[in-house]
């Protein structure tokens, strides 16, 4: 499977869509930060066979719709940029989707290791507690929304790095 | 745990269209995409389409296109079906099927249906 | 487009016995996009494997799910009186998204 040039334009596209969101300045935020501890040594990207990589990556993608499609969500953001943010996001997936199908060897490979997904699924879970206990304020969005597009960066760069071993 | 209840039962004429509802409760999702799955009498699944509620965005099985429509409301979140030109062979039920979010990983959510609604039987006679 | 052949149509076992039910893909299927059901008369279908191997959440591990390329299998160790049903398999295709389903497997008592 190839995560071609579109997949890497796409990539782009959500981090400038994540940036053109911003509603707010993230210095009248300060008192707001919150560290959710970024599980950052699973986008490493060395320890992962392919298909567990792409199984990860999907993870993120998935869990980062889930958070930005909620009725809380909607009424946080722009709905023109919100509705083009979901389509990159809709495409990275179908992308990583049919790279299941296509990658040879896939078939061999495990598709997840189960602790990094848990670590993904477990760090959306805390913006998730972290966004009902700020009560969905739009400081504590302006937060996530800079924590989304810094994790967004991240699987960036692991796709980079899938790419160059293809 | 995601509950998807349908409309009630329908007798149609042949020609004549009919418009199924399945509504979402629970702990849904509209980034995750709700599909249309029919069983004629004595017969097996057969999938019809998907929505992927938050876009609009829809996939429907070669058989149908050109007689299948497929819509959804965010809030409640509720897909509805809509079939024409209906046929004597139409007759069956139609279940609303969605993935389950605590599906790991999540790239095999979408592969699969965890959760069934409890089917709207659609009769087609004259 | 992807047809999935199970056979047999119909087995007749006792409680207590094995079973083996083959679902056979007219091309190569991705194991970890292969799913199987249950269903019951007057019920809605239930998952029971997916990923190929996966077992549900609530599903006895007496049901396991194999195989990969054109051949599946899904074994049943021991029936148990609630476990007689129609069993279907199931793919999934993408892009665009295609879901496929093989015609069913009864397992009746005998």
């Known amino acids: 499977c190839n995560l071609s040039q579109t997949h890497s334009l796409n990539n782009r596209r959500t981090l400038m869509l994540m940036a053109q969101m911003r509603r707010i300045s993230p210095f009248s935020c300060l008192k707001d930060r919150h560290d959710f501890e970024f599980p950052q040594e699973e986008f490493d990207g060395n320890q992962f066979q392919k298909a567990q990589a792409i199984s990860v990556l999907h993870e993120m993608m998935q869990q980062t719709f889930n958070l930005f499609s909620t009725k809380n969500s909607s009424a946080a953001w722009d709905e023109t940029l919100l509705e083009k943010f979901y389509i990159e996001l809709f495409q990275q997936m179908n992308d990583l989707e049919a790279c299941v199908i296509q990658e040879v060897g896939v078939e061999e490979t495990p598709l997840m290791n189960e602790d990094s997904i848990l670590a993904v699924k477990k760090y959306f879970q805390r913006i998730t507690l972290y966004l009902m206990e700020k009560k969905y304020s739009p400081c504590a969005w302006e937060v996530v929304r800079a924590e989304i597009m810094r994790s967004l960066s991240f699987s960036t760069n692991l796709q980079k790095r899938l790419r160059r071993k293809d | 745990e995601v509950q998807l209840l349908e409309s009630g039962a329908e007798v149609k004429r042949p020609g004549s269209s009919v418009r199924v509802s399945c509504r979402a409760s629970?702990?849904?999702?509209?980034?995750?995409?709700i599909s249309w799955v029919r069983q004629a009498p004595g017969q097996g699944l057969e999938w019809m389409g998907r929505?992927?509620?938050?876009?609009?965005?829809?996939n429907y099985a070669q058989n149908f296109r050109g007689r299948i429509t497929i819509t959804a409301d965010k809030s409640p979140l509720t897909a509805y079906l809509e079939l024409s030109s209906l046929r004597f062979e139409d007759t069956a039920v139609y279940y609303c099927?969605?993935?389950?979010?605590?599906?790991?990983?999540?790239?095999?959510?979408?592969?699969?249906?965890?959760?069934w609604g409890q089917g709207s039987l659609v009769t087609v006679s004259s | 487009e992807i047809v999935l052949t199970q056979s047999p149509g119909t087995l007749s076992l006792s409680p207590g016995e094995g079973a083996t039910l083959s679902c056979r893909a007219s091309?190569?299927?991705?194991?970890?996009?292969l799913t199987w059901y249950q269903q019951k008369p007057g019920q809605s279908p239930r998952l029971l494997i997916y990923?190929?191997?996966s077992r549900a959440t609530g599903v006895p591990d007496r049901f396991s799910g194999g195989g990969s390329g054109t051949d599946f299998t899904l074994t049943i160790s021991r029936l148990e009186p609630e476990d007689f049903a129609v069993f279907y398999c199931?793919?999934?295709?993408?892009?665009?998204?295609?879901?496929?389903f093989g015609q069913g497997t009864k397992v009746e008592i005998k």
């Open positions: 091309q190569n299927v991705s194991r970890h996009y």
């Open positions: 199931q793919s999934y295709h993408s892009p665009p998204p295609v879901y496929t």
């Open positions: 929505i992927l509620p938050a876009l609009g965005v829809t």
């Open positions: 629970g702990d849904t999702f509209s980034s995750y995409p």
């Open positions: 099927a969605s993935p389950s979010a605590d599906i790991i990983p999540s790239i095999l959510g979408t592969t699969l249906f965890a959760f």
């Open positions: 990923g190929g191997s």
